[in-house]
């Protein structure tokens, strides 16, 4: 990996898992200042692979609310408005980094978690394997 | 919010921001053991909205690796594979939490960011202003 | 509980347009789930003829495609069928199900028979 | 369209013996999300279909643990594993992960 020069400003760690324990400042600092968030928010009706999006609520992670994409549809919505399976709508899913509470129930002991979220769908040439 | 009851084996914090500044085991745990992770890994090809996915690297962040997806095409392909633009390829962006290092180098102590990533892309039926 | 009830005439003539509606009890049909028209001719086996998803959409089977039509009244929690053209070889039983479009056919209607005579 | 091949298309039994209906499909049937949408029904006379298995090996609400599911691509099997009067009947196999389609169907009846 890339190494970091250490600056002398640095909290210092006694802790013996050091490493794999750290500091996290939870003051959120946004980076998406010129983004419009209203831009994307019509996408999971208009697609031609629509999707719903249902609350995953979990006051042991942080953030506590993730939303899940769910493919409306198996096929894709093709140029007549029906659902044509032709084509397959997929979910798109991403591997995202969450913070879990550990142990359970204590407010500034948390653990790094990895987990996979489906954002939205994609319509997808389906790969036809047929029978000898 | 929901109120969490606190665990009497928390870890304690004598720190005057607490409870902005908490303690995290990067230690990573994954939830993702059921998922197939080469079953999504050709959809960026076969969507009718494909996209490229460029690596975005920066040492002061964690992950310091984030893949963002760029929509090959403005319009989206159609079943004689050509670009067709009554229809739009779009990012489907979603918000996620990194760690960045602060103070800057230093590998103990982070602060959250949220940052948007292109996940994938999607085609969608465009919207049409037409003049008066 | 989820009821689903066929309606419409039992006797079509030939090249005319034959229609049935389903009504469906104890589930909104715009809330979730696809409702499909399924049909089963005298002594033979079932065939899927089409469906209109809870959010609108439909798909029809590409064998009778041209001359299908699947639409609903949400007002009235009904979906209904419509065959235009239709031969001797339309007649069946006509079942109305919920499901279809990833999901099973859990809840069937108890199906309604259309001959087609002059 | 996908073909759904059911074999045999009568199958004699006697009571209490196991019964194995096959069926498959003229190409695989695994959605590009990852899922097989195979479903089994049956029907007995004069009535309308009744589900048992969904998603291969999924048995339905209520549905006796003597029914089992199971295969993958395009190669299924329904299992009855102690065939009972009230299972009498033809059993179709169903795919939903492209047009969805029927099998003929397989009449179940006593030897």
């Known amino acids: 990996g890339i190494t970091i020069p250490r600056n002398p400003g640095c909290p210092n760690s006694e802790d013996k898992n050091f490493p794999r324990t750290v500091m996290v400042n939870l003051n959120i600092h946004n980076r998406n200042t010129n983004t419009n968030p209203k831009r994307s928010s019509d996408y999971y009706n208009r697609s031609t692979s629509p999707w719903n999006l249902h609350r995953n609520e979990d006051p042991e992670r942080y953030p506590s609310v993730i939303w899940e994409a769910k493919c409306r549809h198996l096929g894709c919505i093709n140029a007549d408005g029906n659902v044509d399976y032709h084509m397959n709508s997929v979910p798109i899913q991403q591997e995202i980094l969450v913070l879990r509470r550990e142990p359970p129930h204590c407010p500034n002991s948390f653990r790094l978690e990895k987990i996979l979220v489906s954002v939205g769908c994609t319509c997808v040439t389906p790969i036809v394997h047929h029978v000898a | 919010g929901i109120t969490i009851p606190r665990n009497p084996g928390c870890p304690n914090s004598e720190d005057k921001n607490f409870p902005r500044t908490v303690m995290v085991n990067l230690n990573i745990h994954n939830r993702n053991t059921n998922t197939n992770p080469k079953r999504s890994s050709d959809y960026y090809n076969r969507s009718t909205s494909p996209w490229n996915l460029h690596r975005n690297e920066d040492p002061e962040r964690y992950p310091s690796v984030i893949w963002e997806a760029k929509c090959r095409h403005l319009g989206c392909i159609n079943a004689d594979g050509n670009v067709d633009y009554h229809m739009n390829s779009v990012p489907i962006q979603q918000e996620i939490l990194v760690l960045r290092r602060e103070p800057p180098h230093c590998p103990n102590s982070f602060r959250l960011e949220k940052i948007l990533v292109s996940v994938g892309c999607t085609c969608v039926t465009p919207i049409v202003h037409h003049v008066a | 509980q989820v009821q689903l009830q066929e309606s419409g005439p039992g006797l079509v003539k030939p090249s005319e347009t034959l229609s049935l509606t389903c009504t469906v009890t104890?589930?909104?049909?715009?809330?979730?789930?696809?409702w499909s028209w399924i049909r089963q001719p005298p002594g033979k086996g079932l065939e899927w003829i089409g469906f209109?998803?809870?959010?609108?959409?439909?798909s029809y089977n590409p064998s009778l495609k041209s001359r299908v039509t699947i639409s609903r009244d949400t007002s009235k929690n009904q979906f209904s069928l419509k065959l235009s053209s239709v031969t001797a070889a339309d007649t069946a039983v006509y079942y109305c199900?919920?499901?279809?479009?990833?999901?099973?056919?859990?809840?069937w209607g108890q199906g309604t028979l259309v001959t087609v005579s002059s | 369209d996908v073909v759904m091949t059911q074999s045999p298309l009568s199958l004699p039994v006697t009571l209490g013996q196991p019964a194995s209906i096959s069926c498959r499909s003229s190409?695989?049937?695994?959605?590009?999300?990852?899922?097989?949408?195979l479903d089994w029904y049956l029907q007995k006379p004069g009535k309308s279909p009744k589900l048992l298995i969904y998603?291969?090996?999924n048995r339905f609400s209520g549905v006796p643990d003597r029914f089992s599911g199971s295969g993958s691509g395009t190669d299924f099997t329904l299992k009855i594993s102690r065939v009972e009067a009230e299972d009498l009947g033809v059993y179709y196999c169903?795919?939903?992960?492209?047009?969805?389609?029927f099998g003929q169907g397989t009449k179940l009846e006593i030897k």
């Open positions: 199900a919920r499901g279809g479009d990833g999901d099973s056919f859990d809840y």
């Open positions: 104890g589930y909104s049909i715009s809330s979730d789930y696809a």
């Open positions: 209109i998803s809870y959010s609108g959409p439909t």
């Open positions: 190409q695989s049937i695994v959605h590009s999300n990852g899922n097989t949408y």
């Open positions: 998603k291969v090996s």
């Open positions: 169903f795919q939903g992960s492209h047009f969805p389609t």
